[in-house]
Structure formats: C-alpha cells, structure tokens
Interface confidence: medium
C-alpha cells in the first residue's frame, strides 16, 4: 500500500488526492552526512551530487570487507527516503552527500566537524538558497560538536539530527543535545515509541518531535532498483528534513526558530503512547508527531509559541534551573515544576541581553526544571514588572501598566522554604486582565510586552476539591503563552504548557495526609496578534 | 537542548605556571577545560580537537597549532596537526599522546580541548 | 538460493486449529514485509494478512480476522500463520509471498495445502 | 475494498500472435505524489506458484522476456504478449497494492489456439 509513513505525515485533508506543496523542495539543497551512497539508484538518481568529503575512521577488524553494496546502505536508504523519486517525502529536494560514517556506520566526532565546516565553506564561496543538513548519526554528548552546530544553525543553516537509538534521555548524545539542532525521535505506524531490539528511541527535552522510523521503505543498495524496509532515528530525522525542505521551498526565507516553530505547530499532538518512556522523561518529552503543512502559505500569520524545558537543576538547596529560548524567539512567560512540590517558584532574568526563566529549588527537595514559553513575534518589545511580597492577606499583586503593553505571563518567586505553612491569599479579584496576582509571601513578576495588534485575556480553571492536574486550553485563533498555578495552592508541584493547554499540576494530598480543602486552579494567559491576521489577510 | 549539560567528563586544569616564560602568556587565574565522551568504549585516545577562544583572530589558530608543535618537540613529543578550522570555530585537530594536554590547555587563546570519540549511524 | 518453503499444512476439522511455517532464505529477511496468500481448488488467488519487516505492523482480510494470527520470528528466518476457528471455506493452498515493501510479491513459495473437513 | 475485474476470463491466441488481457480497478490505484500506479501482474502455471511479471502497472520483473509489457493508468490497465509463446500458457492475475486488503482480479486463463 502508500507507505504509512508517507501517509502519516500528510494532512488528513488532502490524503485524497495526495496533496504535495509545490516543487516538493526544489529550491533547497539537503546536506546528508553518513555513510557512502549508491548515486545511481533510481530513486535518487540525478538529484544526488556526491561530493568529494572523505573523513573516515578505518574498518574495525582484520576480515572486515568493504562490499559495496554494504558500505552505501545506510546512507542510500535515507537519501532516498529525504527525497526519492517514489518513496521520498521531498521529491524536488537536490542532495548533497559527504561521506563521514565508513562502512561499519563509525564515523568521528572530528571528521563529523571538518564536513560541517566543509559546509560552511561551500555555503561561503558559493551561496544558494536554503540549505539542510541532516545528521543522521550519533556519538556521546561532545561539547565541541554542538558548538559547531550552533556556529553553523546561526549562519541561517537549518540542522536537523537523529535522536539516537539507545532508548535514553537524548540529552546526552550529540548533536541531539545541540539546542539549535531540530532533534528527532522515532514513532511507528502505531504512533508509538520505536523498539530497536532490547534499546529504541531516544527521549527527553532535547528531543523536538518525533517522526516516522519503523519499517520504512526507502531505496535499496544491493540493486539500483531495489527497496529495503529499515527502522531507527535516522528513518525519522530524513522525513524531518524533506518536510523542512518542502516548507523552505513554499518559504525560502524561514528563520530556523519559524521554521522549528511551524514543525511543531504543524505536527500532530498527543497521539503517541507515553507509557513506554520512562515515567520521570514522559512530562519532557513531546508528544508531536511530524507532518506536512496543510498548505504551503498563509502558515506564517499565526503566532507560534513553543515550550522549553530546563535541564534538571540537581538537589542542592541553592539549585537553579534556567530555560533559554532560540535567538529570534522571545520569552513570553516563565513556570517552573518539581516532582517533590518543593520549590521557591521562578522568574524572568535578563542573561546577556536575552531573557532567560530561571526555577529555585528549595531545602529538601529533589530539584526543579524551569520552563521557557517561547513565541515568535514581530516587533515584540518585553519588560518584566515585579512587585516585592506584600505580606497583606489580599496577596502580592502587580500588573502592566505600560501604555500598549499587555500581560503574557506571571512568575512568582518565595524565598520562605514552604508557602504551605503561611496562610493563602483569602481573595482574588477578578476581572483584571492585565495583573498577576501571588501569594503574600512571595515577589510577583509580570511579562508585559508590546508588538503590533497583540492582545491577549486571562482564562482560569478551577476544581473546588484538590486533583492532581487541572488543565485550561486557549480556543482555537489564540495561542498559550503564560501558564501559571492560582497562587495559594501549597501543595502545587508546578505549571507547564503543553502544545496550547495549559496544566497545572498538585501533590496526590491523600497520601500526604494533608486536610486542606484548597481548590487547585489553573490561569491560562492567552494571546493572539491582530496584526499577524490583518497581514494575512492583506496578502489573500 | 542545552550545551551547558550532558553527562560528559569534565577534567578543568588551572593555569598555574608561565609555561616557558612565554610573553603572551594567559593571565593568571585563566582555566581551559578538558572534556571527553562519557562512554568510555567510543572515547577515541590520542587524537584532539584544541578549541580557543570566540574572539581569537583565524591566523591564531595556526600560530597556536606551531606553538604546540614547537613545546612539544622540545620535550621530545612528536605531534601531527590534523586540520586547522576556520569557519566554524576557531582550533585545529591535533594527534598527540595524552601526555601534552597540560601543555596544550596552558597554550594562550585555548578555551578547551576535547578529546575525540565515535559517532554512530542512527 | 533466494527461496521460501511452507510446511504445516494438512486435514483439520471446522473449528480447529492448524500453524503454517514459511523458512526464507538467500535474502535479509528482517528487511522485508511478508505476505500469506491462499488460491482455494480451482479458483483465484485471494491475499490473506501482511506483517512488516521489524513485525511491528500487521493487516488482515476481514474474511480471516480475529481468527488468524501472523507473526515472524527474524532469529529463525521464519514466517508463521497461526489458523484458529478454521472453516470448510479455508481450504485453499497457503502461499508464503515476500514483498517487494510496496505490498506486491516478488517471490512464492510453492504453498502447502490446508484441507478443512469433518 | 478496491474491486478488481479482468477481462476477458478466458483467452485462445495463436502461437506468434498477440494477447491482450485487460484489468479494472474500482477506484484509481494511481498514487499522485509519486505518479506511480500500484498495480502489477502475476502468471501462474498448472501446479506452480504465480510469478510477478510486472509491477508499477508497466515495469519487467527482472528475468522477464520483454514480449511482456503493462500498461494503462488509474483505473484501467492492459497486459500485452507480443508474440505468444507455448511456454506463456497460464492463468495471469492483476493486483493492486495501493492499499489493504490486497486485491487480485478473477484471473484469465490464456490458451494457444
């Protein structure tokens, strides 16, 4: 039959007639960095150019034989699945391979940086139009492998890499771990996790959205009109990079964030199992699924919010964590979680001229993770406004009082070890768009941002009795951009977005013994830019 | 996806002496770092990328690259430059035996020096 | 030689149970999906379940679903139909086919017949 | 399911001549991102397995003697014996592989005149 992982990843609306945006990637160029390919496999014939980079390590063992059929495999298969004539997702898309994995799939962390630098050269001397680099491989978590990524993803290169297939946090592999690198997990036709014998998919934070990498049919190096079915991170990250190249087609000038941020607004959302990860990565790890845009325009007038998790900040009682957005995106809100409950809260710091959301662990807890909501607007102007503890029973309250600015996200941060022992606010007013409202003890900061048509409204749920998770979505046409628990609530473990929900989780207060009545309530801050509609609609 | 984390071995080697009485030698209380991959079987001995700082000017890169040949040599350590980079980050590859890396991180413009080990096809 | 060859064919009453096996060799058998195809006395050939390279997807005709089970052992080389529930209008030959991965079928076994009879 | 029906059941050629078996799909088996039309053709002889002869609706199975050739596109597909020979005396089948369940047509049983 269609494939399924062709299948999947098209928009259930235009399966009919099997829809495919125009020129199908024509106008970009894929950089494949792996094994040797077979150039003149009929999938992939004419669109390949074979570059003359050779930086391999030798073949372990003595009776190794380099079969050539075997030496081009890996590298065969993924060229034709970024862009085969039948069972690639970008058919247009032109192909560069350089040759840094030997005929084992071993490669270095060296050779591996002297190719992207060979890109970056090529890209200097010669400048085309948009250009991917698919690293289908993985090494151990390389400081100096993720640097160069960076260097390269900030000259406008989109990176796109496999998550790796040990079944672990990917967080430490490289160049899975590089932030600036689109990370890609693999998922079967059964939208779960890929198994690989006794390991499988890598997961966690560092991984951006998952993609088809099970028994996917992709060309064949034993003949050159053979197909062969393989699985792996690999499979899944060349799908990433032939949507990438289809959306670089239909807009060349996509920044990597708008890029990153169109991939994740377009996959689908909450269909893989999350059982098969390990409970402690599942509320890290995406629930995204890659997919073509329904078309090729008209994506962009929308505002795109993503969420970022920290690194864990350890169990020392001083601990912090800090989530960082991408270099065009701009950090609209800051929460923070901990599996322990035991927090002092988070707040938006300036870091070298960017925003950064920084969490605190408290004295006896386990550690916290701070979490970044970073959105793509134009012409975006952020403060914060923080007001110190109020120590009034009304609470700690501040709010935006700039002219034109609105309220994208609160943060409350307490230097006492444990709000639950000082009593909660008794009332909140309501009806205060612009104001974010803390518990007494604690210091309240407020994301107040300017940009052009932007407006946004506060939505909250609440649940008389205490649960373990209370969630509040924003309705379609507006976009999440500030999750935070309702101040008060001590047995709160923290708040997080997830795609456009936002959900406030709380300590199951049945087995702490504890007898508080508090109600748990979650405030969604939503936004949407009125100028970012008008300019859609001006170019319809 | 951050570059501060990983369960990678950190090894941070300060700065103590004026190695050869050199002139442009780091400021006192400077550190290079030393990294290499946390699993140990695809650690690759014997074979490093030497990276310096963010600022420094490409011709460094060469001139640090001779500087460590020159020390080395005279300490009777043969070492084989590999590859100067340009375009991405400043730094040269460099084959040399384990032995120089306290040399090498004392070497002026050096950020860190990373070790280098395997990569996989996924 | 790149060859398939089904065993475990035979007579069985309605109702009862039967297990086909299909031994590939000559080709990387984790590669590549694997049919069962059956052609009863005398008429067509009518195609009866898929399971994919790794295993991890199967498909079925309604005819025989809930009742047969595919399955693939790659350490073996080896590709089961487990038939349970069997009815008279089973009987037909079972052929063992390879997929080219795009689900039509570059190579046959030479079948094994399944008879179900009181 | 995607109904397949061949024409005609049966067919008598002279040895030389040429047979032409046709086959229709119910709905198009014809796949636009690729434009490749999921559909190919198997001959089976007395007491033997089928074997494909052609596949993507008009591409030889390797091995395959080019008097063979396939043709058409959508929903109606032709398969074409140049020059009949003894040896091509079976029954030929089309199938489509555009999706599950798999379908084959009836089957023509071609005989020598």
């Known amino acids: 039959s269609i494939p399924w992982n062709l299948e999947r990843i098209t928009p259930a609306r235009y399966r009919a007639d099997e829809y495919q945006p125009p020129k199908g990637g024509s106008l970009v160029e894929v950089y494949l960095l792996d094994t040797s390919i077979q150039s003149d496999h009929r999938e992939i014939e004419g669109r390949v150019m074979v570059t003359d980079f050779e930086s391999v390590p030798e073949e372990d063992g003595t009776r190794f034989h380099r079969q050539a059929s075997k030496c081009d495999s890996h590298g065969t298969h993924l060229a034709g699945v970024v862009s085969g004539r039948d069972a690639g997702v970008a058919k247009g898309a032109g192909l560069r391979s350089l040759r840094v994995l030997n005929c084992q799939g071993k490669g270095t962390v060296s050779g591996t940086l002297i190719g992207l630098e060979f890109i970056r050269k090529s890209q200097l001397v010669q400048p085309v139009g948009p250009l991917v680099v698919l690293l289908p491989l993985a090494g151990g978590y390389s400081r100096v492998f993720n640097a160069a990524c960076q260097r390269l993803a900030r000259a406008g290169v989109v990176l796109v890499t496999a998550a790796g297939n040990f079944r672990d946090d990917a967080c430490l592999y490289s160049p899975a771990s590089a932030p600036e690198v689109i990370t890609v997990g693999a998922t079967n036709a059964q939208d779960q996790p890929v198994t690989l014998g006794t390991l499988g998919t890598n997961f966690g934070r560092c991984v951006d959205l998952f993609a088809p990498g099970e028994d996917i049919i992709g060309a064949s190096s034993d003949c050159s009109t053979c197909f062969v079915s393989r699985s792996g991170t690999s499979q899944a990250a060349a799908h990433v990079a032939g949507i990438a190249a289809m959306m670089l087609s239909a807009e060349p000038e996509l920044t990597l964030a708008e890029l990153r941020q169109r991939l994740i607004h377009f996959s689908a959302k909450d269909v893989i199992n999350e059982a098969w990860f390990p409970e402690d990565q599942r509320v890290l790890t995406p629930n995204l699924v890659a997919a073509l845009p329904p078309s090729t325009h008209r994506a962009g007038w929308q505002l795109f919010c993503r969420t970022v998790w920290s690194a864990h900040s350890g169990p020392t009682r001083m601990a912090t964590a800090v989530a960082r957005c991408a270099q065009d995106e701009e950090l609209l809100s800051c929460s923070s979680f901990s599996r322990s409950g035991k927090r002092r809260g988070e707040r938006i710091e300036a870091q070298g001229g960017k925003r950064v959301c920084r969490a605190h662990n408290a004295f006896g807890g386990e550690g916290v993770y701070a979490i970044a909501r970073c959105c793509l607007l134009p012409q975006v102007n952020c403060s914060v406004h923080t007001a110190p503890p109020a120590g009034a029973s009304m609470g700690t309250r501040v709010h935006c009082h700039q002219q034109g600015h609105v309220l994208t996200g609160c943060s409350s941060h307490w230097e006492v070890e444990d709000l639950g022992t000082h009593k909660p606010p008794v009332l909140r007013p309501r009806g205060q768009p612009n104001q974010c409202v803390g518990h007494r003890e604690a210091s309240i900061h407020a994301s107040c941002c300017h940009a052009p048509g932007l407006e946004c409204k506060v939505k909250e749920h609440g649940i008389p009795a205490p649960q373990e998770q209370v969630i509040v979505a924003c309705e379609d046409g507006w976009t999440l951009t500030g999750c935070s628990p309702l101040p008060g609530t001590s047995h709160v473990l923290g708040a997080y977005a997830v795609d456009n929900t936002c959900v406030v989780r709380s300590r199951d207060v049945s087995t702490t013994g504890s007898t508080s009545k508090e109600a748990v309530a979650a405030v969604a801050i939503c936004c949407r830019s009125r100028h970012l509609v008008q300019a859609s609609q001006e170019l319809q | 996806q951050e570059d501060e984390d990983g369960d990678y071995e950190e090894l941070v080697l300060a700065l103590r002496s004026e190695e050869d009485g050199l002139a442009d030698a780091p400021e006192h209380g400077a550190t290079a770092t030393f990294h290499r991959c946390a699993k140990d079987p695809w650690r690759l001995p014997g074979t490093y990328v030497v990276v310096l700082k963010e600022e420094t000017h490409r011709s460094q890169s060469e001139r640090t690259a001779r500087r460590l040949q020159a020390q080395a040599a005279r300490r009777g350590y043969l070492t084989k430059i590999l590859h100067v980079f340009h375009h991405l980050l400043p730094g040269f590859l460099v084959k040399m035996s384990g032995d120089l890396l306290e040399l090498a991180l004392k070497l002026p413009h050096v950020d860190y020096i990373e070790e280098d080990s395997s990569v996989f096809a996924q | 030689e790149v060859q398939l060859v089904e065993s475990g064919g035979g007579l069985v009453q309605p109702g009862g149970s039967l297990r086909l096996s299909c031994a590939a060799s000559g080709f990387t058998f984790n590669n590549y999906a694997m049919n069962w195809v059956r052609q009863a006395p005398g008429k067509g050939l009518d195609w009866v379940s898929t399971?994919?390279?790794?295993?991890?997807?199967?498909n079925y005709a309604d005819s025989v679903k809930g009742r047969f089970i595919i399955s693939r052992d790659s350490s073996k080389h080896t590709l089961y139909l487990q038939m349970n529930s069997l009815r008279a209008e089973d009987t037909a030959v079972y052929y063992c086919?390879?997929?080219?991965?795009?689900?039509?079928?570059?190579?046959w076994g030479r079948g094994t017949l399944v008879t179900v009879s009181s | 399911d995607i109904v397949m029906t061949q024409s005609p059941d049966s067919l008598a050629v002279s040895l030389g001549e040429r047979a032409t078996i046709n086959c229709k799909s119910s709905?198009?088996?014809?796949?636009?991102?690729?434009?490749?039309?999921?559909l190919g053709w198997y001959q089976q002889k007395p007491g033997q397995p089928p074997n494909l002869l052609i596949y993507w609706a008009s591409t030889r199975e390797s091995g395959v003697p080019d008097r063979f050739s396939g043709s058409g596109s959508g929903t109606d597909f032709t398969l074409t014996i140049s020059s009949l020979q003894a040896e091509d005396v079976a029954v030929y089948y089309c199938q489509q592989y555009y999706t599950t369940p798999y379908t084959f047509g009836q089957g023509t049983k071609l005989e020598i005149k």
């Open positions: 086919a390879k997929d080219s991965n795009w689900g039509n079928f570059d190579l």
């Open positions: 399971i994919s390279g790794s295993g991890g997807t199967t």
């Open positions: 709905q198009s088996v014809l796949y636009r991102s690729n434009n490749r039309n999921f």
